[in-house]
Interface confidence: medium
Amino acid sequence: FERTRSLQDPCSNCPAGTFCDNNRNQICSPCPPNSFSSAGGQRTCDICRQCKGVFRTRKECSSTSNAECDCTPGFHCLGAGCSMCEQDCKQGQELTKKGCKDCCFGTFNDQKRGICRPWTNCSLDGKSVLVNGTKERDVVCGPSPADLSPGASSVTPPAPAREPGHSPQ
């Protein structure tokens, strides 16, 4: 029955780029300007995405496919289909109101996006610092001091600054 009904449904004959117009006896009408249908049998066309502001058009909308956006120079895409744009910074920096600023001592950012976060406090887990942290890298925690063999040394961790809100300008 389902198969028979679909064969009798005139809308199933409407190709991509058209919609089944109920106001015109289910005739296949072309999608209006600034809209598209990417599959056949659609009863409506979808509105084209508009690449405005910090977004720029990578691919124009057509009757069968949506527009695709990327970001203006100095910004990078985030999210599926470039749903957000964020200003470029470097590893070891974060974006502030005054632009990209270096992470302050005791904090790091290992990505080209995002913010500076405090280094891991190894001692909270009863471990010692194996490798010191930098602006670009978190500390690496090693065995607890008690686990170290006699004569072995560990790097003494600097007291982490818990004020990433106050990087040197």
Epitope: G79, E86, T96, K97, R113, D138, E163, P164, G165, H166
Partner: antibody, heavy 118, light 107 residues
Framework: EVQLVQSGGDLVRPGGSLRLSCTVS????????MHWIRQAPGKKLEWISD????????HYADSVKGRFTVSRDNTKNSLYLQMNNLRADDTAVYYC???????????WGRGTLVTVSS | SSELTQDPAVSVALGQTVRITCQGD??????ASWYQQKPGQAPILLIY???LRPSGIPDRFSGSSSENTASLTVTGAQAEDEGEYYC??????????FGGGTQLTVL
């Protein structure tokens, strides 16, 4: 389509424990910071924890430090919140959220209700 | 930890413009982000960065910033804009803090 599916909410007695889960699909999970944010009934949103892409960098709000533990399994696209020594004021809807840049909470789960009551 | 202060409630006539503000020391350094939340639903990101909207957010929503204040402006408010609006930024320890929320009523 990005989806964050949450589970684990329940009624628990004060002092009890609970583990919340959040499974993510539709995005490269291991690239992004993940967060837990809660909202007590009729109250404002409260950030409680985040975890870095590799799971090594974790941070907590003072209100949950020492009681809650966040973890992630990138092979399962999953985020967890282990909650111990629960108190009545932990009663809230708990949301998981992803942050593309760790700064803005973009995709949110639908939330799961945790009720702490005797 | 830092606090972000919002007016508890504002109202606007249908089609008119309304501004919701958020104040806090952390906003001297960092931009706020803004979220809309409707009853029983998760929040939705409206504005982030200097004045950026995620794809799909109507351009009637805009953001601005000065000194320690961030503002969300809704130009030509619609009935569906009713809800709670939260600002969000960093605190002095690098963690996140939300404002107390502003209930927007569209008359």
């Amino acid at each position: 389509e990005v989806q964050l599916v949450q589970s684990g909410g329940d009624l628990v007695r004060p002092g009890g424990s609970l583990r919340l889960s959040c499974t993510v699909s539709g995005l490269p999970y291991s690239d992004y910071y993940m967060h837990w944010i809660r909202q007590a009934p009729g109250k404002k949103l409260e950030w409680i924890s985040d975890i870095g892409p590799r799971g090594t960098s974790v941070h907590y709000a003072d209100s949950v430090k020492g009681r809650f533990t966040v973890s992630r399994d990138n092979t399962k696209n999953s985020l967890y919140l282990q909650m111990n020594n629960l108190r009545a004021d932990d009663t809230a809807v708990y949301y998981c959220a992803n942050a593309f840049s760790s700064s803005w909470f973009y995709n949110w789960g639908r939330g799961t209700l945790v009720t702490v009551s005797s | 930890s830092s606090e972000l202060t919002q007016d508890p409630a504002v109202s606007v006539a249908l089609g008119q413009t309304v501004r919701i503000t958020c104040q806090g020391d952390s906003l001297r350094r960092y931009y706020a982000s803004w979220y809309q939340q409707k009853p029983g639903q998760a929040p939705i990101l409206l504005i982030y960065g200097k004045d950026l909207r995620p794809s799909g957010i109507p351009d009637r929503f805009s953001g601005s910033s000065s000194e320690n204040t961030a503002s969300l402006t809704v130009t030509g408010a619609q009935a569906e804009d009713e809800g709670e609006y939260y600002c969000n930024s960093r605190d002095s320890s690098g963690n996140w803090v939300f404002g107390g929320g502003t209930q927007l009523t569209v008359l």
